[in-house]
Interface confidence: low
Amino acid sequence: CRTSECCFQDPPYPDADSGSASGPRDLRCYRISSDRYECSWQYEGPTAGVSHFLRCCLSSGRCCYFAAGSATRLQFSDQAGVSVLYTVTLWVESWARNQTEKSPEVTLQLYNSVKYEPPLGDIKVSKLAGQLRMEWETPDNQVGAEVQFRHRTPSSPWKLGDCGPQDDDTESCLCPLEMNVAQEFQLRRRQLGSQGSSWSKWSSPVCVPPENPPQPQVRFSVEQLGQDGRRRLTLKEQPTQLELPEGCQGLAPGTEVTYRLQLHMLSCPCKAKATRTLHLGKMPYLSGAAYNVAVISSNQFGPGLNQTWHIPADTHTEPVALNISVGTNGTTMYWPARAQSMTYCIEWQPVGQDGGLATCSLTAPQDPDPAGMATYSWSRESGAMGQEKCYYITIFASAHPEKLTLWSTVLSTYHFGGNASAAGTPHHVSVKNHSLDSVSVDWAPSLLSTCPGVLKEYVVRCRDEDSKQVSEHPVQPTETQVTLSGLRAGVAYTVQVRADTAWLRGVWSQPQRFSIEVQVSD
């Protein structure tokens, strides 16, 4: 027999299928030009000393073979003795180690069998009614195809699925979408309506994330407020990485999960911008304000569930940093300025009330005054901190107030609003005999004592109504009792108490008259 022809004789080896697991498989035959044909196959197992024979049986029942030697591809013409216009059955027999191994048969009409390509270009992936939709451009001159897909997850083997026949310039496939695991897909095509036509190779992997991006399991910690009024947010636990199927490991475009950090600064609501979204890798510095922090995971199908934390405000107070002067025209605050052209946000809220009731005011960018101080003034008519109660004041500063992560805390302190000197006057002053020359003076705590750091001291004044002599006794702000000694029996005294702040002298309480009775001996 000539090598270019199909030889209609018995092949030069015994006809016995070894039934071994190795051997030839995936036989594909198709027309490659007007008069030439090609068959190719794969061989599984050791290739040394293997000879391959392409077998062909015609519809008449006559059979022939081509000797391919060690090659796994063979070309022949329409003059090789194989009928190309009628159905033929082809298979490969491989003679190795004194045994014959056979491939599965393919039955086809060679003339109409065209080599089909898998989807070659960009495969677009989208979500459609809870399923995965893949779409691609039909390879040139190959409209009319059957399409199959196979898919696997990190823990499951390949499963085969059918996209059905396609007959358009674009082809598409609906595939199952997994809720919580990534999948690898491959697609293959074959000629539509051509009996026994060969499948193309599998396409490159298409890596698809789960419908729900994994919920970010992260933990944050926040450092203490530094001298610059900022504290670092640090990530204690990195988000878990998505497990990927084998073909998607390494570079797997499509399965990426991005984690974003959404900051919401709850304090200072009058500032221009309250939220900012950052990449999770870039951990920001925060002021001492209260924040809500959300970590949002998203993939190509959109955002998933987020995880939210509340970062409470840093309530470390600096009672000496803020000077407040109350005049007839209004009130002015002074504090050490941060730098040139700083915008300040002054926030205040009544102590003991819900954080949602904070009020704030934004200053225009200001430079320090000659004494290096920044100021904020308000008139009595504005009503700011006008009620006689304790307010918690926080001042934030930023050179770029539109950038949420550039705010810093200047100071936090307490302030008693309204007419503090009158409101702070101690009430319920009472005098009790203590000994023959002393009395105990008690009073109810001043309203100023509800305001940490505001009450500097109490002063108790005792006046001798006979001699008009006056003595004053300072009392610690935590005490509400003092003993006055060295008093004379039978003399009338008046006692008064006032509460002083660091910048305001209090108003005396109503005078309380008393005297120590003269003791008459029997």
Partner: nanobody, 118 residues
Framework: EVQLVESGGGLVQAGGSLRLSCAAS????????VAWSRQAPGSQRELVAS???????KYADSVKGRFTISRDNEKKMLYLQMDSLKPEDTAVYYC????????????WGQGTQVTVSS
């Protein structure tokens, strides 16, 4: 849930006409190919006509020139205009939708009976 509901079937004399309708819900209709198939008693189901998402049509040889398939993406409706009906067109007609242009589509309706009397 995907639902395909056929209507318009009935009894008609040979040479007459019928228009079948199919209302789709729960499916992104415009992205799917849609088709009509039929099954006569004792026979296998055969594809009658299909229309791709880009409005390319395909007909079985036995109905070419007599049947017309059309679709309305906005209303999510599929239609089959059947003219010059013959007794051999008697069958249950099913509406199908899915990603293919042939019989093995993803979803089928319950069917509507068409009877052509001579």
């Amino acid at each position: 849930e995907v639902q395909l509901v056929e209507s318009g079937g009935g009894l008609v004399q040979a040479g007459g006409s019928l228009r079948l309708s199919c209302a789709a819900s729960g499916i992104a209709f415009r992205y799917n190919s849609v088709a009509w198939s039929r099954q006569a008693p004792g026979s296998q189901r055969e594809l009658v006509a299909s229309i791709s998402n880009s409005a390319r049509t395909k007909y079985a040889d036995s109905v070419k020139g007599r049947f017309t398939i059309s679709r309305d993406n906005e209303k999510k409706m599929l239609y089959l205009q059947m003219d010059s009906l013959k007794p051999e067109d008697t069958a249950v007609y099913y509406c199908g939708a899915g990603r293919s242009m042939a019989g093995d589509v993803a979803y089928w309706g319950q069917g509507t009976q068409v009877t052509v009397s001579s």
